[in-house]
């Protein structure tokens, strides 16, 4: 007869491991007992369990409640056992020693491999600001056994670097994603992808990029200077900019306070029916946590009685 087993049994942490040991005997041969032991190199055999044809299953105190025979029906030549709720410390070499009649004793070894799936974590880097050089956008760390693979999935252009730390029974892998921040990256997903043989599918953690910036400011509303004449209603100036975080707007008049009746509504400056009092230099001040910008315009309110038109100056300043 001969023993049938596996060279390697692979199981995911927390699952049950079936340790196979089947005696393929000749007709009339019987198995008296099967002794299972852990036999890691440099250490003596440690009892796991004993399956006896008469006495039944004996489980070592160290494995009490964790070793069982497979559910019935059971073949009397089958010395396989189930190791419940495999933990990392169970990884190692196991031996089944089968005592048969009349053929004598046989033994076989197998290696139990316990896969420890990673629980990845993604840590964003420092705040990203337009104008910075190469900057850490995010780092992703995953620890498992064997070492997991950590990659990035994104449309954003950048560079990656990885490092790993070996522990006694696992390895931690950290991958960093660096980029040169630009406003076009705002709202773009950056996804850490972790692969591991203990995972049914890759684990993905997505981080949305936020790049702080503030665009140049400009003022719209003076495109047709002839519309700015005494008595015109609904005249308005609109300050144009964009930023992350979204900016706030403030209007002032350079050559004095805002005239009465002029309404400030965020980025818009609304005028009552125009008079010559509304002529002046108006400044739009745009700011966010990242930066601030100014844009100023000169408003000349035309008197229709006068033949000659007035010049309108648009000046943009930062």
């Amino acid at each position: 007869g001969e023993l049938e087993t596996s060279d390697v049994v692979t199981v995911v942490l927390g699952q049950d491991a079936k340790l196979p040991c089947f005696y393929r005997g000749d007709s009339g041969e019987q198995v008296g007992q099967v002794a299972w032991a852990r036999v890691d190199a440099g250490e003596g055999a440690q009892e796991l369990a004993l399956l006896h044809s008469k006495y039944g299953l004996h489980v070592s105190p160290a494995y009490e409640g964790r070793v069982e025979q497979p559910p019935p029906p059971r073949n009397p030549l089958d010395g396989s056992v189930l190791l419940r709720n495999a933990v990392q410390a169970d990884e190692g070499e196991y031996e089944c020693r089968v005592s048969t009649f009349p053929a004598g004793s046989f033994q076989a070894r197998l290696r139990l491999r316990v896969l420890v799936p990673p629980l990845p974590s993604l840590n964003p880097g420092p705040a990203l600001e337009e104008g910075q050089g190469l900057t850490l956008a995010a780092s992703c760390t995953a620890e498992g056994s064997p070492a997991p693979s950590v990659t990035w999935d994104t449309e954003v252009k950048g560079t990656t670097s990885s490092r790993s730390f070996k522990h006694s029974r696992s390895a931690a892998v950290t991958s960093e994603f660096h980029l040169v921040p630009s406003r076009s990256m705002n709202g773009q997903p950056l996804t850490c992808v972790v692969s591991h043989p203990g995972l049914l599918q890759d684990q993905r953690i997505t981080h949305i990029l936020h790049v702080s910036f503030l665009a140049e400011a400009s003022v719209r509303g003076l495109e047709d200077q002839n519309l700015w004449h005494i008595g015109r209603e609904g005249a308005m100036l609109k300050c144009l900019s964009e930023g992350q975080p979204p900016p706030s707007y403030n209007w002032t008049r350079l050559d004095g306070p805002l005239p009465s009746g002029v309404r400030v509504d965020g980025d818009t400056l609304g005028f009552p029916p125009l008079t010559t009092e509304h002529s002046g230099i108006y400044v739009c001040h745009v700011s966010n946590e990242f930066s601030s910008r100014d844009s100023q315009v000169t408003v000349d309110v035309l008197d229709p009685q006068e033949d000659s038109g007035k010049q309108v100056d648009l000046v943009s300043a930062s």
């Epitope: 007992q33 002794a35 055999a45 004993l50 006896h52 006495y55 039944g56 004996h58 105190p61 020693r97």
Partner: antibody, heavy 123, light 107 residues
Framework: EVQLVESGGGLVQPGGSLRLSCAAS????????MSWVRQAPGKGLEWVSG????????YYADSVKGRFTISRDNSKNTLYLQMNSLRAEDTAVYYC????????????????WGQGTLVTVSS | DIQMTQSPSSLSASVGDRVTITCRAS??????LAWYQQKPGKAPKLLIY???SLQSGVPSRFSGSGSGTDFTLTISSLQPEDFATYYC?????????FGQGTKVEIK
């Protein structure tokens, strides 16, 4: 024919010592683990101590730990129990018994027993 | 330690009666259970090992059953030489422990 014969029992004062012997014959002595089991007058059976076939592994009941020592001389096919600091509650008939090693520290039931030797601890 | 609880502690029966003695272990012991018979002034004698296997030379009227925690010794037809004290013993763990015994007396 398997035979186990105990000797060495007797009357001893509390605090005294006694050495029991069990001579085995009729089988391969080293193939079997051996035990001492006692029975106080009118009481049930109580396992006292056990030893593996090689003598490497020894086991004791909590009630005798630190006072009794089990040993064996495989060249003489003899099992021993050295009893020190004896107490009145150690008074009993002491039996030796054999059990076959299955594997590790797992043994069969004790299939052969000696006739017993009486130990009386009294002042 | 594993506790072995035997019942009854004593019973009276007549020759030819069917006698049943039970033994319960405080935790599972598979079939690592033996039954012994002891007569006054004599050493215990192994009757049943591995819960249900008859020791060589023991009459077939003795039988054992059970596994795990609950075990039974049955004497199918009590004979005059069967009046004795019966003990169960577990040898699943060290220390091996005995039940307190069941004394079978003549009614």
């Amino acid at each position: 024919e398997v035979q186990l014969v105990e000797s060495g029992g007797g009357l001893v004062q509390p605090g005294g010592s006694l050495r029991l012997s069990c001579a085995a014959s009729g089988y391969n002595f080293t193939d079997y683990g051996m035990s001492w089991v006692r029975q106080a007058p009118g009481k049930g059976l109580e396992w006292v101590s056990g030893i593996s076939g090689s003598g490497d592994n020894k086991y004791y009941a909590d009630s005798v730990k630190g006072r009794f020592t089990i040993s064996r001389d495989n060249s003489k096919n003899t099992l021993y129990l050295q009893m020190n600091s004896l107490r009145a509650e150690d008074t009993a008939v002491y039996y030796c018994a054999r059990a076959e090693l299955l594997a590790f520290d797992v043994y069969t039931a004790s299939d052969y027993w000696g006739q017993g030797t009486l130990v009386t601890v009294s002042s | 330690d594993i506790q072995m609880t035997q019942s009854p502690s004593s019973l009276s029966a007549s020759v030819g009666d069917r006698v049943t003695i039970t033994c319960r272990a405080s935790q599972g012991i598979s079939s690592y259970l033996a039954w012994y018979q002891q007569k006054p002034g004599k050493a215990p004698k192994l009757l049943i090992y591995a819960a249900s296997s008859l020791q060589s030379g023991v009459p077939s009227r003795f039988s054992g059953s059970g596994s795990g925690t609950d075990f039974t010794l049955t004497i199918s037809s009590l004979q005059p030489e069967d009046f004795a004290t019966y003990y169960c013993q577990q040898h699943y763990t060290t220390p091996p422990t005995f039940g307190q015994g069941t004394k079978v007396e003549i009614k």
